[in-house]
């Protein structure tokens, strides 16, 4: 059963390491994949002393942990590298950090990247 699935055909692309990797630094990435597989967008970033440094954004292959996520939200508590994935075109344009501990109330730190 699949409820209200949104197709992902393109994602915001960013690569902080673009010169070494010989890619564009920023743009829109079309998402390719097998026709029977779902596609997602992702974002990964670091928080260096309160300053957000985007590492990469782009397309992500079919991954069940990305299903039914319309927003790109990292919920893990204090990761070294923040990661989120989502479904829907350009859904990784904005990403957020909502640490969700088992007992404590979630706190909100939404981020709009400006590469």
């Amino acid at each position: 059963a699949i409820l209200g699935r949104s197709e992902t055909q393109e994602c915001l692309f960013f690569n902080a390491n673009w010169e070494k990797d010989r890619t564009n630094q920023t743009g829109v990435e079309p998402c390719y994949g097998d026709k029977d597989k779902r596609r997602h967008c992702f974002a990964t970033w670091k928080n260096i002393s309160g300053s957000i440094e985007i590492v990469k954004q782009g397309c992500w292959l079919d991954d069940i942990n990305c299903y039914d996520r319309t927003d790109c939200v990292e919920k893990k508590d204090s990761p070294e590298v923040y990661f989120c994935c989502c479904e829907g075109n350009m859904c990784n344009e904005k990403f957020s950090y909502f640490p969700q501990m088992e007992v404590t109330q979630p706190t909100s730190n939404p981020v709009t990247p400006k590469p």
């Epitope: 059963a1 699949i2 409820l3 209200g4 699935r5 994949g33 097998d34 029977d36 597989k37 779902r38 292959l61 079919d62 991954d63 069940i64 942990n65 990305c66 299903y67 039914d68 996520r69 919920k75 893990k76 508590d77 990661f83 994935c85 969700q100 501990m101 088992e102």
Partner: antibody
Framework: EVQLLESGGGLVQPGGSLRLSCAAS????????MSWVRQAPGKGLEWVSA????????YYTDSVKGRFTVSRDNSRNTLYLQMNSLRAEDTAVYYC???????????WGQGTLVTVSS | QTVVTQEPSFSVSPGGTVTLTCGFN?????????PSWYQQTPGQAPRTLIY???TRSSGVPDRFSGSILGNKAALTITGAQADDESDYYC??????????FGGGTKLTVLG
Amino acid sequence: EVQLLESGGGLVQPGGSLRLSCAASGFTFRNSAMSWVRQAPGKGLEWVSAISVTGGSTYYTDSVKGRFTVSRDNSRNTLYLQMNSLRAEDTAVYYCAKVYYYSFFDYWGQGTLVTVSS
Amino acid sequence: QTVVTQEPSFSVSPGGTVTLTCGFNSGSVSTSYYPSWYQQTPGQAPRTLIYNTNTRSSGVPDRFSGSILGNKAALTITGAQADDESDYYCVLYMGSGIHVFGGGTKLTVLG
């Protein structure tokens, strides 16, 4: 520490029903896809079912479609497997597994034994 | 119906190297299937060894490594030890929620 504790297994007659539960702790349950995997006595592991973070998408191996239903209660940190119309070939240890990015099983429960026999 | 194939059994001498493989009936295994590997000893729950083709799970010794060899996923154990004697399972993620286990390989460490 991540813990997955299955319960609800037991002896049931063919055609009967059982509901398995998996109580999760030590991680943000609502942020993880989950799966059920089973192992018949002396046999290999077999993926049974999976469910997305919200419960909005559910998946099954062909042999249990229409008979088994996977669900989750994110407020209770619990995963369920409702098993109806049970057959002898469903006899197995049922493991609950946490699914992480790259769609792999990063943590496993200790399993609960389901025996279908008359 | 996708069938994932593994060698049913394999033997290795202590200190030796063994490579277990994982293929499937409908084409080549690639990194997009996120191959993962699990170790299981009798009566125990499985233990995660390798995920995403070649990433070792936390606490797994570097004697275990994963790769793609030709059209199959592979698990290589170097410097095999007596306690590596176990069943090893590969899993391929077929997409759209579906995981498929291989039949498992029973590894015997000789001696």
